[in-house]
Interface confidence: medium
């Protein structure tokens, strides 16, 4: 417990102190006081540096004094032989004696009193920045006019904080400018502009005079600008060392001016203004900005248009232009939107063809379609090359997105027919010689494939069976072989409107317009054993002349048997119609003279007994195309004959091309379009 005064006596005082003693006393007076310690008696064995016996006075770790020997007062009016005055409120007195004393020593008597200290003068460091006032037990600080005492109750400063500047233009100066600024102050100014404007600070060189930096380059007094997470400064010295214009990129700026205890510098003055916040000008090779400007600022709006072949993808759709606004934070709205190459996606596959996998599906990429050669070709005659266009579609050279169509190659047998021997008088043939050959099992007859969905045959073949079953791709029509061939199912039968239907078909004498079309349910896949035959052209080149050769094939009656199980074929010449008229008709059910001969019929045969016969009906009379010798076209269809092995009559297909095409067009299969 602190006391204001006290007495300290050596052990056994005033008797001699004992040997080998160590004793200490802790002196404590109240805070705000010093200690006056004085000795009125001192009789301690003398030794060099008081090494044997001593009284030591300690202030913390600092030794204030060490005493030994005998002392007397120099002042007749005062009993004090030694004294100590310390400005602290704590002291420690330590007495020590060694193991022997040659004489009898009586020790010491000491007294302490609490004394007032003058904090204003007694210390090297002044406790107050400005005025110091001492009183018993303490002190207080005070300030000159216009200054105020900080919370630490020691430092005075000027009241220069709290100003908020919101005008778009303004001027700020240090306190008293251009007179010297106050020491020991921290001035804070805030500039707060409307969002979308950045604070731009301008300081003239001559408007800045702040205490220079110390030898290590540290500013003793400093001016600092803080905008968000960026700082400009600290600045000090004579003449502004920073840039003349500070663009803060922020609508909020804090100005902090910190001064120390000394200095006679005049301070600073600055101007600020609000500039609309700039947004970066972004040069991109994929878009155009309108309007084009050297600089874009807050509230500016640009229309960004993607260049051809580029788009902005958002959600599931693409756009080619958008607006962007320079926002209050100096960033463009819609900055996530970028013009990127249009993606055409994976090209669609096509029937009877394939498409290359493109290296890329983006704008400008190229791919190629090909048809399954040699059985299909590209209908529009293009090279199949498509590129990814700016509208996101794969387009051909004509810039059409229409997919190429692979259509069957017509009239080209994989193996040409080489029959040399003498159907009747014909030769064995392979289906590869006549890949267009269609077999009808009821009635036993033939037909010609002219398209993947259409079979051409004679009207009399289908008049009694509107749902025929057909087969393609097999040389043999044995049941076991047919099971392995391709069966075709009819969707609908179209008999020529000029074909007269009879109650008793066997008594027919008029075979005019003996032609029919069978539409198939499913498309036929072409290959080496299945391919269509071409239709005749409409030009005069396709007008048959007597002696022109044609090929016929079928599984009809031969010399040896009623039906052939393997395909037979023969090469026949075209003959004048009168040759057919002259042959006597073998039909007990009809009047021989009643048979009708018309220009819709071709007469052929008569050479070496080669002829078509019952069971070959509907098959093609195939003639080499005059404009492309590698191809055959269907010039005729096996129709009727006066007598097998002589001349036969064939439906003249050239006269029906318009009807064939019209029927096919009007009844085209949707999936095929």
């Amino acid at each position: 417990e602190p006391t204001m005064y006290g007495e300290i006596l050596s052990p056994n005082y005033p008797q001699a102190y004992p040997s080998e003693v160590e004793k200490s006393w802790d002196i404590e007076v109240p805070e705000g006081y010093g200690i006056h310690l004085y000795f009125t008696h001192l009789d301690i064995e003398l030794s060099e540096n008081c090494a044997y016996d001593s009284v030591q006075i300690m202030s913390g770790d600092i030794e204030e004094g060490r005493l030994c020997g005998q002392r007397t007062s120099n002042n007749p009016h005062s009993p004090i032989v030694e004294e100590f005055q310390v400005p602290y409120n704590k002291l420690q007195v330590i007495f020590k004696s060694d193991f022997s004393n040659e004489e009898r020593f009586t020790g010491f008597a000491a007294y302490y009193v609490a004394t007032d200290i003058n904090e204003c003068t007694d210390f090297v460091d002044a406790p107050c920045s400005h005025f110091c006032n001492n009183f018993i037990g303490g002190y207080f600080c005070s300030c000159p006019p216009e200054y105020f005492l900080h919370d630490d109750m020691k430092n005075c400063g000027v009241n220069c904080s709290g100003d908020v500047f919101t005008a778009l233009i303004g001027e700020i100066a240090s306190p008293n400018y251009p007179k010297p600024y106050p020491e020991n102050s921290r001035c804070e100014y805030q500039i707060r502009l409307e969002k979308g404007f950045q604070v731009v600070v301008t300081v003239r060189r001559e408007d800045f005079d702040v205490e220079p930096a110390d030898s290590e380059g540290n500013c003793l007094d400093s001016l600092v600008f803080v905008a968000g997470d960026q700082q400009f400064g600290p600045y000090c010295g004579r003449g502004f060392p920073g840039p003349l214009n500070i663009e803060t990129k922020s609508n909020a700026l804090d100005i902090i001016f910190q001064t120390d205890l000394t200095g006679q510098n005049k301070g600073w003055k600055l101007r600020y203004h609000g500039d609309p916040m700039p947004c970066p000008k972004e040069e991109t090779p994929t878009s155009v900005w309108e309007p084009a400007k050297a600089k874009y600022v807050f509230r500016d709006v640009v229309r960004i248009t993607c260049l051809d072949g580029f788009e902005v993808v958002e959600g599931r759709v693409g756009a080619t232009s958008f607006h962007s606004t320079c926002q209050s934070n100096g960033k463009w709205s819609n900055s996530k939107l970028k013009c990127q190459p249009v993606d055409c996606g994976i090209p669609e596959s096509i029937e009877n063809g394939k498409v290359e996998d493109p290296e890329s599906t983006l704008f400008g990429s190229v791919t190629r379609y090909t048809c399954e050669e040699p059985y299909y070709y590209m209908e529009n005659g293009g090279n199949g090359q498509y590129h990814c266009a700016s509208n996101g579609s794969w387009v051909n050279e004509a810039l059409s997105p229409e997919l190429p169509k692979c259509v069957p190659v017509c009239g080209v047998p994989r193996e040409p027919f080489e029959g040399k021997q003498r159907i009747i008088g014909g030769s064995d043939a392979d289906i590869k010689n006549f890949p267009w050959q269609v077999f009808f099992d009821n009635p036993w007859a033939g037909g010609a494939l002219i398209d993947e969905y259409w079979v051409l045959t004679a009207a009399h073949v289908v008049e009694g069976n509107q749902e025929p079953t057909m087969y393609v791709g097999s040389t043999s029509v044995q049941t076991s072989r047919l099971a392995k061939s391709k069966m075709l199912t009819s969707e609908r039968v179209f008999i020529h409107p000029g074909w007269k239907l009879l109650e008793v078909p066997e008594a027919r004498t008029n075979f005019d317009n003996d032609i029919a079309l069978v539409q198939l349910k499913d498309p036929v896949k072409m290959g080496p054993t299945v391919a269509p035959i071409c239709l005749p052209g409409t030009s005069s080149d396709y007008n048959l002349m007597d002696g022109d050769l044609g090929l016929i094939a079928g599984w009809g009656r031969t010399e040896k048997r009623d039906r052939a199980l393997r395909l037979k074929a023969a090469r026949l010449p075209v003959a004048p119609l009168r040759k057919c008229r002259e042959v006597k008709v073998e039909n007990p059910k009809a009047d021989a003279g009643a048979y009708v001969f018309t220009p819709n019929m071709i007469c052929a045969g008569g050479e070496k007994g080669m002829d078509s016969c019952k069971g070959d009906s509907g098959g093609a009379f195939a003639v080499q195309d005059p404009n492309d010798k590698a191809k055959f076209y269907v010039a005729g269809l096996v129709s009727w004959g006066p007598q097998c092995g002589t001349y036969g009559l064939y439906t003249r297909v050239q006269n029906y091309v318009d009807w064939i095409k019209k029927t096919m067009q009007e009844n085209s299969t949707p999936s095929k379009d």
């Epitope: 509230r299 709006v301 229309r303 902005v312 958002e314 959600g315 599931r316 756009a319 958008f322 607006h323 606004t325 926002q327 934070n329 960033k331 709205s333 819609n334 900055s335 996530k336 939107l337």
Partner: antibody, heavy 116, light 107 residues
Framework: QVQLVQSGAEVKKPGASVKVSCKAS????????MHWVRQAPEQGLEWMGW????????IYAQKFQGRVTITADTSTNTAYMELSSLRSEDTAVYYC?????????WGQGTLVTVSS | DIQMTQSPKSLSASVGDRVTITCRAS??????LDWYQQKPGQSPKLLIY???YRYSGVPSRFSGSGSGTDFTLTISSLQPEDFATYYC?????????FGQGTKLEIK
């Protein structure tokens, strides 16, 4: 496919705060803006603000400035909206939405009820 | 802030009718305007973006037009599933503001 799944309904007392989450799947939120829109009962839609998760830039409608904080955690592909100092008029369904050019995808909404 | 005003606030119509909803902006928003459809208990769905572009999967009976301050949403032939509330929204500048909505009801 793109989905925004929001946290469940909340009941709060006036003065409290609420934090609604919006978990995205099927896309990376860093490539989009994430918006928050609210709809009071029988009222229209009200845009609150957005965040650019790539750099944590956020812009708020003046009406909510100081009360709303929109954040994003790109590691979990989730956006958050925290509204403080709740009052009864903050009772609403809160939606998150994704955009670049328009709000193509929306969360299912989170009902926040403020009641003493 | 840009104010968006829709009219009418509500309207009754029959299946098959042609319906027009207008939206007016308090200042020029160029073509930065989108239309949304909202049914009770559901989140809004985007119909039209950038004033006139139909969003993917939106039926062709919905169309949008306009630029600057005046915009129109047209439904050429109302279907039963079209009865809902429709909102316009400007995304020209923040804050992105919505119209107050137009409630389309069955007559």
């Amino acid at each position: 496919q793109v989905q925004l799944v929001q946290s469940g309904a909340e009941v709060k007392k006036p003065g409290a705060s609420v934090k609604v989450s919006c978990k995205a799947s099927g896309f990376n939120i860093k490539e989009y803006y994430m918006h928050w829109v609210r709809q009071a009962p029988e009222q229209g839609l009200e845009w609150m603000g957005w965040i650019d998760p790539e750099n944590a830039d956020a812009i708020y409608a003046q009406k909510f400035q100081g009360r709303v904080t929109i954040t994003a955690d790109t590691s979990t592909n989730t956006a958050y909206m925290e509204l403080s100092s709740l009052r009864s008029e903050d009772t609403a369904v809160y939606y998150c939405a994704r955009s670049r050019l328009f709000f193509a995808y929306w969360g299912q909404g989170t009902l926040v009820t403020v009641s003493s | 802030d840009i104010q968006m005003t829709q009219s009418p606030k509500s309207l009754s119509a029959s299946v098959g009718d042609r319906v027009t909803i207008t939206c007016r902006a308090s200042q020029d928003v160029r073509t930065a305007l989108d239309w949304y459809q909202q049914k009770p208990g559901q989140s809004p769905k985007l119909l039209i973006y950038s004033a006139s572009y139909r969003y993917s999967g939106v039926p062709s009976r919905f169309s949008g037009s306009g630029s600057g301050t005046d915009f129109t949403l047209t439904i050429s032939s109302l279907q039963p599933e079209d009865f809902a509330t429709y909102y316009c929204q400007q995304q020209y500048t923040t804050p992105y503001t919505f119209g107050q909505g137009t409630k389309l009801e069955i007559k």
